[in-house]
């Protein structure tokens, strides 16, 4: 599930990783745009092994993956798109 959250909370990520995560290991991705209490964009990935990691938004692999997901957002996805807005 790909989520885009708009939230007034402070930054969620206390550390970020650039290590590649194969898509088959990913259960859900959450994107937190910058602003609204956090000065940077954050990307949170839930893995199928019940772990969770913040991914460096500058990591090439996550940028490529996000682009693929956006392009496929009108069709069935391995990681379906889910957008949710929080006031």
């Amino acid at each position: 599930v790909l989520e885009v959250y708009y939230t007034s909370l402070r930054c969620r990520c206390v550390q970020e990783s650039s290590v590649f995560i194969p898509r088959r290991f990913i259960d859900r991705i959450q994107i937190l745009p910058r602003g609204n209490g956090c000065p940077r964009k954050e990307i949170i990935v839930w893995k199928k092994n019940k772990s969770i990691v913040c991914v460096d938004p500058q990591a090439e692999w996550i940028q490529r993956m996000m682009e693929v997901l956006r392009k496929r957002s009108s069709s069935t996805l391995p990681v379906p798109v889910f957008k949710r807005k929080i006031p």
């Epitope: 949170i44 839930w46 969770i52």
Partner: antibody, heavy 122, light 107 residues
Framework: QVTLKESGPGILQPSQTLSLTCTFS??????????VGWIRQPSGKGLEWLAN???????YYNPSLQNRLTISKDTSNNQAFLKINNVDTADTATYYC??????????????WGQGVRVTVSS | DIQMTQSPSSMSASLGDRVTITCQAS??????LIWFQQKPGKSPRPMIY???NLANGVPSRFSGSRSGSDYSLTISSLESEDMADYHC?????????FGSGTKLEIK
């Protein structure tokens, strides 16, 4: 308000099966990212992680005890369970259940029950 | 399995002292470490998460640090209410493993 409370037999004999129940409120094990774990602590000693169960029924066990442990849940009644087969005196401990929520920042075992004391004695 | 070697197992310190407890990880855990405080007869409570971050409601005299595979919990000025057992937990990978615990007593 998140609360958890453990219940169990108090005392049992070697070779019996220990059955523990964790009854919780303030969260649901049907919610994405929610999990409950079991941890034990022999008197005056350190903590030992035993098992976790997650919202999707995914289960993780401590390999040193895996063949004796069974974790399960009853989502509708907000309960989690742990069974330990073939107990021995070394299983005498206080048993805790604790919540984990897969959110960032991830703090496993952020809420704990009060613990239940279990004694294995012949 | 990842082994967490915690030291000291017990220590006694005076009020106002600076106190440090250490856990050494047998493999890289990349800051996936929590420090719990457990007061006598009570359940553990998270104090520090991701090695260096203070949990909600924890006094600022507590801090966490890392040097290589060594993770430390420091109390800058010991108070009587800090008398407790302290446990580290690695959650980098299953099985989660705790250190053996440190009993902190007041002189």
């Amino acid at each position: 308000q998140v609360t958890l409370k453990e219940s169990g037999p108090g005392i049992l004999q070697p070779s019996q099966t220990l059955s523990l129940t964790c009854t919780f409120s303030g969260f649901s094990l049907s919610t994405y990212g929610m999990g409950v774990g079991w941890i034990r602590q022999p008197s005056g000693k350190g903590l030992e992680w035993l098992a976790n169960i997650w919202w999707d029924d995914d289960k993780y066990y401590n390999p040193s005890l895996q063949n004796r442990l069974t974790i399960s849940k009853d989502t509708s009644n907000n309960q989690a369970f742990l069974k330990i087969n073939n107990v021995d005196t070394a299983d005498t401990a206080t048993y805790y259940c604790a919540r984990s929520e897969l959110i960032m920042p991830y703090v496993p075992f952020d809420y704990w029950g009060q613990g239940v004391r279990v004694t294995v004695s012949s | 399995d990842i082994q967490m070697t915690q030291s000291p197992s017990s220590m006694s310190a005076s009020l106002g002292d600076r106190v440090t407890i250490t856990c050494q990880a047998s493999q890289d855990i990349d800051n996936h470490l929590i420090w719990f405080q457990q007061k006598p007869g009570k359940s553990p409570r998270p104090m520090i998460y991701y090695a260096t971050n203070l949990a909600n409601g924890v006094p600022s005299r507590f801090s966490g640090s890392r040097s290589g595979s060594d993770y430390s919990l420091t109390i800058s000025s010991l108070e009587s209410e800090d008398m407790a057992d302290y446990h580290c937990l690695q959650f980098k990978q299953y099985p989660f493993t705790f250190g053996s615990g440190t009993k902190l007593e007041i002189k």
